[in-house]
């Protein structure tokens, strides 16, 4: 059977299959039976990232420093600008429209994964044998002190928030 539709990079207009404009260009005029689709490159700070028939290019995203944003990758005529967050902040969404400070892991919790510009701190509870006595965005759970290696004995048991307290061994005669 003959094609009843246009080819992949074409669109139907006035009974003609016209070529779409390639990424980075916008549509100025549709083709006719005897003229070609007319496309023009997007201007400075504009882009189109697909084969299209758009008459206007999209504006590049603005990375607003007042929202804690900075440019991670400058946009081109075919790609949008990619924003990320300043040091100590991370994006609130996948599209990274604003930033919030990284959260700290409370005592009893340690950092499992340090935050990046696009992801928050991931905390984990300190397991038995480990503790964290600070609120921190960087510190992992630390192991309890090993009293034995210091030739000492445990005088006070450790918790997930406190280290063990070591003391001298009782010498009995």
């Amino acid at each position: 059977e003959p094609p009843t539709a246009c080819r992949e990079k074409q669109y139907l207009i006035n009974s003609q299959c016209c070529s779409l404009c390639q990424p980075g260009q916008k549509l100025v005029s549709d083709c006719t039976e005897f003229t070609e689709t007319e496309c023009l490159p997007c201007g400075e700070s504009e882009f189109l990232d697909t084969w299209n028939r758009e008459t206007r290019c999209h504006q590049h995203k603005y990375c607003d420093p007042n929202l804690g944003l900075r440019v991670q990758q400058k946009g081109t005529s075919e790609t949008d600008t990619i924003c990320t967050c300043e040091e100590g902040l991370h994006c609130t969404s996948e599209s990274c429209e604003s930033c919030v400070p990284h959260r700290s892991c409370l005592p009893g919790f340690g950092v499992k994964q340090i935050a990046t510009g696009v992801s928050d701190t991931i905390c984990e509870p300190c397991p038995v044998g480990f503790f964290s006595n600070v609120s921190s965005a960087f510190e992992k759970c630390r192991p309890w002190t090993s009293c034995e290696t210091k030739d000492l004995v445990v005088q006070q048991a450790g918790t997930n928030k406190t280290d063990v307290v070591c003391g001298p061994q009782d010498r009995q005669r």
Epitope: E8, Q10, L20, T37
Partner: antibody, heavy 121, light 107 residues
Framework: QVQLVQSGAEVKKPGASVKVSCKAS????????MHWVRQAPGQGLEWMGW????????NFAQQFQGRVTMTRDTSISTAYMEVSRLRSDDTAVFYC??????????????WGQGTLVTVSS | DIQMTQSPSSLSASVGDILTITCRAS??????LNWYQQKPGKAPNLLIS???RLRSGVPSRFSGSGSGTDFTLTISSLQPVDFTTFYC?????????FGQGTKVEIK
Amino acid sequence: QVQLVQSGAEVKKPGASVKVSCKASGYTFAGYYMHWVRQAPGQGLEWMGWINPDSGGTNFAQQFQGRVTMTRDTSISTAYMEVSRLRSDDTAVFYCAREKITMTGIYFDYWGQGTLVTVSS
Amino acid sequence: DIQMTQSPSSLSASVGDILTITCRASQNITTYLNWYQQKPGKAPNLLISAASRLRSGVPSRFSGSGSGTDFTLTISSLQPVDFTTFYCQQTFTTPWTFGQGTKVEIK
């Protein structure tokens, strides 16, 4: 304006290969399928097949399958047609032609000037 | 494959004559039928698409008709530039096929 400019005439020995180029200008190359047509001396037109310049996909007439390769380089808007294991009866003019689709029909609206390939020992 | 049979394969005519070339498809191709003119040493040139649509810039002495399996190209008043070869082509299904051509010579 749309132009399809083909490479120059070639003389080849039997068993050799030949690669004909077709450089497109004046339109979006990836937007239209390119076809190849063969015409032996004093003979009629014979459709060989098409290439989708965007994906590189091809479709051949059965008698050209296996011995004919169609490729493209989108960076320079050029389609290529290669015939391997040439025989003397492959002597012909090869044309590239652009496909145009409307809702009433499909046709070739622009043709290259043709490339004569002579196969002779 | 769809066979396209053109007739006659050659003919002699005079300037001013009315000329009719026929093309028969081996199966129904609706109106997916084109006519091309080819001058010696040149690439073919589209005259008519979709059986009857005259291409812009082509003289009005050319006309096409037909649908299904039987098609006709008519030249109402032959001019000196028309003494060339004409081909029909079906684009209903691949492989796209051409008629064997009709060579028009001066009587």
